[in-house]
């Protein structure tokens, strides 16, 4: 057992029915020595007497607020909750792998640019009784300081009979260099409680892999005199690092046709414009990825040819 | 990815179509070794981060960009002192902290040098013959050093009387080419820097 | 004590449906994921297929995929094989347990597949 | 389809030392725990081992489990003829997760 925060405490159990749980010794925070009485939630039975109380926890029924009184007063709570480990491998009931980048990818974390700003999401399908606390580090050992947010409602997506609801979370490295060569991974850490049941995830990654520019702004069309050949041109996103001369992007121009069957034509460049022949229905669409570290394409920034 | 390779204008930056080739072999090279060595923990997220270069040299620190020297967290460790005399620099332009900069950056390139050749020579060894270090990579690394003309003392190439451990030749290899390729992304993006000041 | 006791093997012609049960007692049945094992006449065991406590979740072996459904009924406390589209390749006792560091077997349920 | 591999077949008279070895890889045996199981002819698997090297209450203490790196091994000391049966070994993979991967199963026989 141990304290997530004041008051609320979390039992480790090898889950597997008639399991025998774990013994818990309950204090009641008080002075007092005599006349104590426990209780479990909103139940009135009395569980037991005196300033402790030894409990067997096996089941959820097992957990939940414990009360001790004395003459009608309430003198301290104490909130079990449980975390189950099945077959060695703790449970991840609460969010949804969601299988990319591979499979048992809880949390996913994305940044527009190096200076040490990230956010994560992570999906679950349950709506109610549901918090979620996160805190970051460079490192594990010796860590450095990141700084999260809360988590927030992101989302929500109805998936066949499911809803589904999307949490996110922004952290910011407090000393971050965006031109450092990083040698700790960033390691992220999310405590889950659903009810009674408590679950933690965790991603481990270098800031470099998780890169994801914003598209590139300001895609612009010049029509070739006497040609079917135009000019794209486009700019850095405004997110993106600074100075771009360091900093720099490659880009990847492609003219689509209305129809997802034709034939796609894709121009890889690492200027901010590209001449192209454009038809008719056609759109032309651009996207950027860091030049010399290839993490994730750009969302598409796109404008129609005619 | 497929990029169609740009080829240098004779007035350009001449150390940055080396620095675009050496990036281009190492990756290549370290995905030949993720591959080959698919049974030995060669991912990033297997491997410990090493820098051979830590406390010896300080490339980061000497090529940071003139805009990011307010950003404190990137002035750590400044102080470094270098020979000053190389063919890469367009001579009048050349500031003393660009002179810096670039022997850091051969002095790493000669470090990771006599590394992959002790490796190679080991890897030679290996009665399975599993992976040995690509000669273009080894070649790229030469050019570089050699356009960017520093004087300094050759590193002997270290011997070891000791059987080789190929196990932790291959894990160490992969340490390297993980750490290297890291390296050559930030020689690349200083080139590419230096280029259009 | 934890028991689960099988039903529904039997002899099947190839392309035919077939479902297995699985009744569980004592214990809370629906506190705990629960797999489908089988093991072909003179072969090692396979795993085929897992379904979590409440049902939400499910996971299939290549072989079975697309083929067999894992299901449950908490309140019936019964777990269910549906097998369909049948080869003589699926011929074998098929084992249901609970999923835990320690854990429970059913008494094994014999399927032939064979026209 | 099995990627934990065992000895087809292992021998001993009563009294003997006899170990099963179960050989795996990094993503299974290297980062998840180990079961053994005994299999006699016409029953269900019965659980020796749980979590590399602990025995269920019940189990007799010449049987014993041990994992190191990618590979894990059960161990009968003296092992008598009740204990010719079949023996398989499971993990899982850290990708597929709940999947069960068994390993080929040792027959384990009992000379004499």
């Known amino acids: 057992i141990w304290e997530l925060k004041k008051d609320v405490y979390v039992v480790e159990l090898d889950w597997y029915p008639d399991a025998p749980g774990e013994m818990v010794v309950l204090t009641c925070d008080t002075p007092e020595e005599d006349g104590i009485t426990w209780t479990l939630d909103q139940s009135s039975e009395v569980l037991g007497s005196g300033k402790t109380l030894t409990i067997q926890v096996k089941e959820f029924g097992d957990a939940g607020q414990y009360t001790c009184h004395k003459g009608g007063e309430v003198l301290s709570h104490s909130l079990l909750l449980l975390h189950k480990k099945e077959d060695g491998i703790w449970s991840t009931d609460i969010l949804k792998d969601q299988k990319e980048p591979k499979n048992k990818t809880f949390l996913r974390c994305e940044a527009k640019n190096y200076s040490g700003r990230f956010t994560c999401w992570w999906l679950t399908t349950i709506s109610t009784d549901l918090t979620f606390s996160v805190k970051s580090s460079r490192g594990s050992s010796d860590p450095q300081g990141v700084t999260c947010g809360a988590a927030t409602l992101s989302a929500e997506r109805v998936r066949g009979d499911n809803k589904e609801y999307e949490y996110s979370v922004e952290c910011q490295e407090d000393s971050a260099c965006p031109a450092a060569e990083e040698s700790l991974p960033i390691e992220v850490m999310v405590d889950a409680v659903h009810k009674l049941k408590y679950e933690n995830y965790t991603s481990s990654f270098f800031i470099r892999d998780i890169i994801k520019p914003d598209p590139p702004k300001n895609l612009q069309l010049k029509p070739l005199k006497n040609s079917r050949q135009v000019e794209v041109s486009w700019e850095y996103p405004d997110t993106w690092s600074t100075p771009h001369s360091y900093f720099s992007l490659t880009f990847c121009v492609q003219v689509q046709g209305k129809s997802k069957r034709e034939k796609k034509d894709r121009v890889f460049t690492d200027k901010t414009s590209a001449t192209v022949i454009c038809r008719k229905n056609a759109s032309i669409s651009v996207r950027a990825q860091d030049r010399y570290y290839s993490s994730s394409w750009s969302e598409w920034a796109s404008v129609p040819c005619s | 990815r497929n990029l169609p390779v740009a080829t240098p204008d004779p007035g350009m930056f001449p150390c940055l179509h080396h620095s675009q080739n050496l990036l281009r072999a190492v990756s290549n090279m370290l995905q030949k070794a993720r591959q080959t060595l698919e049974f030995y923990p060669c991912t990033s997220e297997e491997i410990d981060h090493e820098d051979i270069t830590k406390d010896k040299t300080s490339t980061v620190e000497a090529c940071l960009p003139l805009e990011l020297t307010k950003n404190e967290s990137c002035l750590n460790s400044r102080e470094t002192s270098f020979i000053t005399n190389g063919s890469c620099l367009a001579s009048r332009k050349t500031s003393f902290m660009m002179a810096l900069c670039l022997s850091s950056i051969y002095e790493d390139l000669k470090m990771y040098q006599v590394e992959f050749k002790t490796m190679n020579a080991k890897l030679l060894m290996d009665p399975k013959r599993q992976i040995f270090l690509d000669q273009n990579m080894l070649a790229v690394i030469d050019e570089l050093m050699q356009a960017l003309n520093f004087n300094s003392e050759t590193v002997p190439q270290k011997s070891s009387l000791e059987e080789p451990d190929f196990y932790k030749t291959k894990i160490k290899l992969c340490i390297l080419l993980h750490a290297f390729r890291i390296r050559a992304v930030t020689i690349d993006r200083v080139m590419s820097y230096l280029n259009a000041s | 004590q934890v028991q689960l006791v099988q039903s529904g093997g039997g002899v099947v012609q190839p392309g035919r449906s077939l479902r297995l049960s699985c009744a569980a007692s004592?214990?809370?049945?629906?506190?705990?994921?629960m797999h489908w094992v089988r093991q072909a006449p003179g072969k090692g065991l396979e795993w085929v297929a897992f379904?979590?406590?409440?049902?939400?979740?499910?996971y299939y072996a290549d072989s079975v995929k697309g083929r067999f459904t894992i299901s449950r009924d908490n309140s019936k406390n019964t777990l269910y094989l549906q097998m369909k589209s049948l080869r003589a390749e699926d011929t074998a006792v098929y084992y249901c347990?609970?999923?835990?560091?320690?854990?429970?077997w059913g008494q094994g349920t014999m399927v032939t597949v064979s026209s | 389809s099995y990627v934990l591999t065992q000895p087809p077949s292992v021998s001993g008279t009563p009294g003997q030392r006899v170990t099963i070895s179960c050989s795996g890889g990094?993503?299974?045996?290297?980062?998840?725990?180990v079961k053994w199981y005994q299999q006699l002819p016409g029953t269900a698997p019965k659980l020796l081992i749980y979590?590399?090297?602990q025995r269920p209450s019940g189990v007799p203490d010449r049987f014993s489990g041990s994992k190191s790196g990618t590979s894990a091994s059960l161990a009968i000391t003296g092992v008598q003829a009740e204990d010719e049966a079949d023996y398989y070994c499971?993990?899982?993979?850290?990708?597929?997760?709940?999947?069960?991967?068994f390993g080929t199963g040792t027959k384990v026989t009992v000379l004499g």
């Open positions: 379904i979590r406590y409440d049902g939400s979740n499910k």
């Open positions: 347990k609970t999923h835990g560091s320690h854990d429970n």
């Open positions: 990094r993503s299974n045996i290297g980062s998840n725990t």
């Open positions: 004592g214990f809370t049945f629906s506190s705990y994921g």
């Open positions: 499971q993990s899982y993979d850290r990708g597929t997760h709940p999947a069960l991967l």
């Open positions: 979590f590399n090297d």
